[in-house]
């Protein structure tokens, strides 16, 4: 004959441990039932009657079957540099994300305690490793032939474009200028400039200097950060 | 803490060679570009040059390209400068700086070594 | 190459003063200034960049500000700490300090 199914509250056997959903009471010394996700324990149960669960009141939560008496408060509103990617409802925790152009600085459980903004890379410097959720942009110095005149989170070193004749070099942080004529290409064989892999790395070694980032022209240079009060836009 | 630790001061001879270390700590080294600065006695401050310490890229000063060599070395988190044929023009302190390359330029320095070149 | 110059290259004030020292850029260097101060025996100290920034834990007394190719440093309230050789740095351009100013007290 089929075991009999036991209805909580129940005695457990000797030796054996309460079914899924349920659990071991030390004071009235049975297996009862859990509350359900977005509930909590209301009365706790006893030999003869069984646990009584309530829905949790507003702004707070259970994510999880569970015996608590109270439950969980739902973490504080985002902030102005969050986002919030998940609401806070009676079976899950509000989870706030950093927004677009920031990272996580300081992780939490789930979602993030600190935003910090991505780090923008001056003009001479590319962006050698993009930021994502949780680390920072990593800036490095254009190589020769390639440039940036921007400040951007995102922006690479590109090459500077060839000329049939240069009326101004480029440099780290300024596209070569031609003359009237049209360029040859407008890029550089390669594309673009990536950080070069890890193997490479030079140790104890000289590699040969870049050539200075300091053109002697006073014009054609890159749009510098802006006063905070008075808009982005440079001179 | 972001910390760069310079070595102690270096007496040279007139001709003879330097090495100035700086070791960084606090922050991942391979991050940022290390400059170079110079200060002569009661003097102002001169910048020498820069090295990415993840590729060895550098870049100098023309003044400074014939005198020093920027090296580094990734896996002990430090920087080096070497001050070839020592004169007494070289006689100066010189420091270390990490820079970003964003607009937050040189936030952390070494404290200083002292050169003295003298016969 | 940009030259940069700083005046004036000693300055005398009282503590409470409202000090102001400049730098002037010989060609555009389009906001990438830097000031540092330098005490005495000690390494230099970021205070502003970008021209405008306050380095964090910079005393809200020190400002930067620009007209055309001039920048400015201002301290608000002179104070006794504050006695120290001041470079501003232009990065746009390659890298440059200026001769600097010595701030000391009256």
């Known amino acids: 004959l089929p075991a009999q199914v036991a209805f909580t509250p129940y005695a457990p056997e000797p030796g054996s441990t309460c079914r899924l959903r349920e659990y071991y009471d030390q004071t009235a010394q049975m297996c009862c039932s859990k509350c359900s996700p977005g509930q909590h324990a209301k009365v706790f149960c006893t030999k003869t009657s069984d646990t009584v669960c309530d829905s949790c009141e507003d702004s707070t939560y259970t994510q999880l079957w569970n015996w608590v008496p109270e439950c969980l408060s739902c973490g504080s509103r985002c902030s102005s540099d969050q986002v919030e990617t998940q609401a806070c409802t009676r079976e899950q925790n509000r989870i706030c994300t950093c927004r677009p152009g920031w990272y996580c600085a300081l992780s939490k459980q789930e979602g993030c305690r600190l935003c910090a903004p991505l780090r923008k890379c001056r003009p001479g410097f590319g962006v050698a490793r993009p930021g994502t959720e949780t680390s920072d942009v990593v800036c490095k110095p254009c190589a020769p032939g390639t440039f940036s005149n921007t400040t951007s989170s995102t922006d690479i070193c590109r090459p500077h474009q060839i000329c049939n004749v240069v009326a101004i070099p480029g440099n780290a942080s300024m596209d070569a200028v031609c003359t009237s004529t049209s360029p040859t290409r407008s890029m550089a064989p390669g594309a673009v400039h990536l950080p070069q892999p890890v193997s490479t790395r030079s140790q104890h070694t000289q590699p040969t200097p870049e050539p200075s980032t300091a053109p002697s022209t006073s014009f054609l240079l890159p749009m510098g950060p802006s006063p905070p009060a008075e808009g982005s836009t440079g001179d | 803490e972001v910390h760069l630790q310079q070595s102690g001061p270096e007496v040279g001879r007139p001709g003879s060679s330097v090495k100035i270390s700086c070791k960084a700590s606090?922050?991942?080294?391979?991050?940022?570009?290390i400059h170079w600065v110079k200060q002569s006695p009661g003097q102002g401050l001169e910048w020498m040059g820069w090295?990415?310490?993840?590729?060895?890229?550098?870049d100098y000063a023309d003044k400074f390209k014939k005198k020093a060599t920027l090296t580094a070395d990734a896996s002990s988190n430090t920087a080096f400068i070497h001050l070839s044929r020592l004169t007494s023009e070289d006689t100066a302190t010189y420091f270390c700086?990490?820079?970003?390359?964003?607009?937050?330029?040189?936030?952390?320095w070494g404290q200083g070594t002292s050169v003295t070149v003298s016969s | 190459n940009i030259q940069l110059t700083q005046s004036p290259s000693l300055l005398s004030a009282s503590v409470g003063d409202r000090v102001t020292l400049s730098c002037n850029g010989s060609?555009?260097?389009?906001?990438?200034l830097a000031w540092f101060q330098q005490k005495l025996g000690e390494a230099p100290k970021l205070l502003i960049y970008?021209?405008?920034s306050l380095q964090t834990g910079i005393p809200s007394r020190f400002s930067g500000s620009r007209s055309g190719t001039d920048y400015t440093l201002t301290i608000s309230s002179l104070q006794p700490e504050d006695v120290a050789t001041y470079f501003c740095?232009?990065?746009?351009?390659?890298?440059?300090f200026g001769a600097g100013t010595k701030l000391e007290l009256k």
């Open positions: 740095f232009q990065y746009n351009n390659g890298y440059m």
């Open positions: 606090g922050y991942t080294f391979t991050d940022y570009i």
């Open positions: 090295i990415d310490p993840d590729y060895g890229n550098t």
């Open positions: 700086a990490r820079d970003d390359g964003s607009p937050l330029v040189m936030d952390a």
């Open positions: 060609q555009n260097i389009d906001n990438y």
């Open positions: 970008s021209t405008y």
